[in-house]
């Protein structure tokens, strides 16, 4: 419950939230579990902690491992674990299963595809969408906030959808991509 799997691609931004939630006023300390080394909070570091969030800007394959977050209230300390895996970028179009977020289902009346993890990032529109690596074009596709809406959904719309956006941190931009499968169900 308080261990969470997170994954990302090398040279992209990855932001992980401590699985152990606390009130906003509580302090959070992050450690690299294997070495018990404290994660710095200074933003000049490529990997740094920012309250409930652990930021990899950008991520490297060597960052993979288990990170411990300790949330501290005035009287209680509670621990969570983030199991982070950073993968090399694939040269071909296929997105392997281990990089896929949960599958969503849609129908003619409800065809929203939410861009996974986007709420953790400081992003601004536009949000780009791809299906099986092809940029989506045409009036049936509408990028709305953090969703993709498909009008008049058809069986052929099933497939793997990737959202791509830019995370901004102190004026520096980092790319993020996330992919999930979309299935079409009958009403």
């Amino acid at each position: 419950k308080f261990s969470k799997q997170s994954w990302g691609l090398e040279n992209e931004a990855l932001i992980v939230r401590c699985p152990r939630q606390g009130k906003p006023s509580y302090t959070v300390d992050w450690y690299y579990s294997q070495t018990n080394e404290s994660i710095p909070t200074q933003e000049r570091n490529r990997v740094f902690a920012s309250g409930q969030l652990l930021k990899f800007l950008p991520a490297a394959v060597a960052d993979s491992g288990i990170y411990t977050c300790i949330v501290r209230s005035p009287t209680f300390n509670r621990t969570g674990y983030a199991n982070v895996t950073i993968y090399k970028k694939q040269s071909d179009c296929n997105v392997p299963d281990y990089l896929m977020y949960s599958t969503v289902s849609g129908s003619e009346k409800n065809s929203k595809i939410y861009c996974p993890t986007i709420d953790l990032y400081n992003w601004t529109a536009p949000l780009e969408w791809f299906k099986n690596c092809q940029a989506l074009q045409g009036s049936r596709y509408r990028a709305h906030k953090s969703f993709l809406v498909i009008d008049n959904v058809m069986t052929e719309d099933a497939g793997d959808y990737t959202c791509k956006f830019i995370h901004n941190e102190n004026g520096a931009n980092y790319s993020v991509t996330a992919t999930r499968s979309f299935t079409v169900k009958d009403e």
Epitope: K1, F2, Q21, G22, K23, S73, T75, F76, R78, T79
Partner: antibody
């Protein structure tokens, strides 16, 4: 120093009503979830009801659902339990307690308890 | 609802002895389990949270262990003030539930 002080207990006939209060001090009452727990004479502890902090979402044990109402007045630092249609099996010491951590959708332990107020339901 | 079963119901021991109390959950509660101590005429007092962490001000002789469905509270060497009733409580989901209690009495 955190303090919780219950009041409002007493003897009431079956089918009657009672309103318990819990005055809180020594902490920022509005941000904490608050809980009522009861203990029948010589028995164990039973969770009765919880109320979220500023959001005010409420939860009830099946045994009291529809009869008891938990509420709070953050401006008065006071927790309430309105008890209607009381039964003999509601006879217990009623404690109010603080959940020092919980976030929306989760619960935690009870770190501070009041001294309790006795409710006796009998004819 | 999650049922917590404590054993034994009563534990008769002498001061200085080790007390081992058990709490078993009807389904997994991860580490969302607490232990409380209650003395006659008093409100319960929190001892252990998240299965194994001592609450502020609780002596080191109290320790908790376990995860999932099986938990243990250990008092390494009983002091006279430790004779009381002990309850476990799960907080993974509502309704919050308590065990029926274990009474630790003087032998």
């Amino acid at each position: 120093e955190v303090q919780l002080l219950e009041s409002g207990g007493g003897l009431v006939q079956p089918g009657g009503s009672l309103r318990l209060s819990c005055a809180a001090s020594g902490f920022t009452f509005s941000i904490y979830d608050m809980i009522w727990v009861r203990q029948a004479p010589g028995k164990g502890l039973e969770w009765v009801s919880s109320i979220r902090g500023e959001g005010g979402g409420t939860y009830y044990a099946d045994s009291v659902k529809g009869r008891f109402t938990i509420s709070r007045d953050n401006s008065k630092n006071t927790l309430y339990l309105q008890m209607n249609s009381l039964r003999a099996e509601d006879t217990a010491v009623y404690y109010c307690a603080r959940d020092p951590w919980s976030t929306e959708g989760s619960f935690f332990v009870l770190d501070y308890w009041g001294q309790g107020t006795l409710v006796t339901v009998s004819s | 609802e999650i049922v917590l079963t404590q054993s034994p119901a009563t534990l008769s021991l002498s001061p200085g002895e080790r007390a081992t109390l058990s709490c078993r959950a009807s389904q997994s509660v991860d580490d969302d389990l607490a232990w409380y101590q209650q003395k006659p005429g008093q409100a319960p007092r929190l001892l252990i949270y998240d299965a194994s962490n001592r609450a502020t001000g609780i002596p080191a002789r109290f320790s908790g262990s376990g995860s999932g469905t099986d938990f243990t509270l250990t008092i390494s060497s009983l002091e006279p003030e430790d004779f009381a009733v002990y309850y476990c409580q799960q907080y993974i989901t509502a309704p919050l539930t308590f065990g029926q209690g274990t009474k630790v009495e003087i032998k």
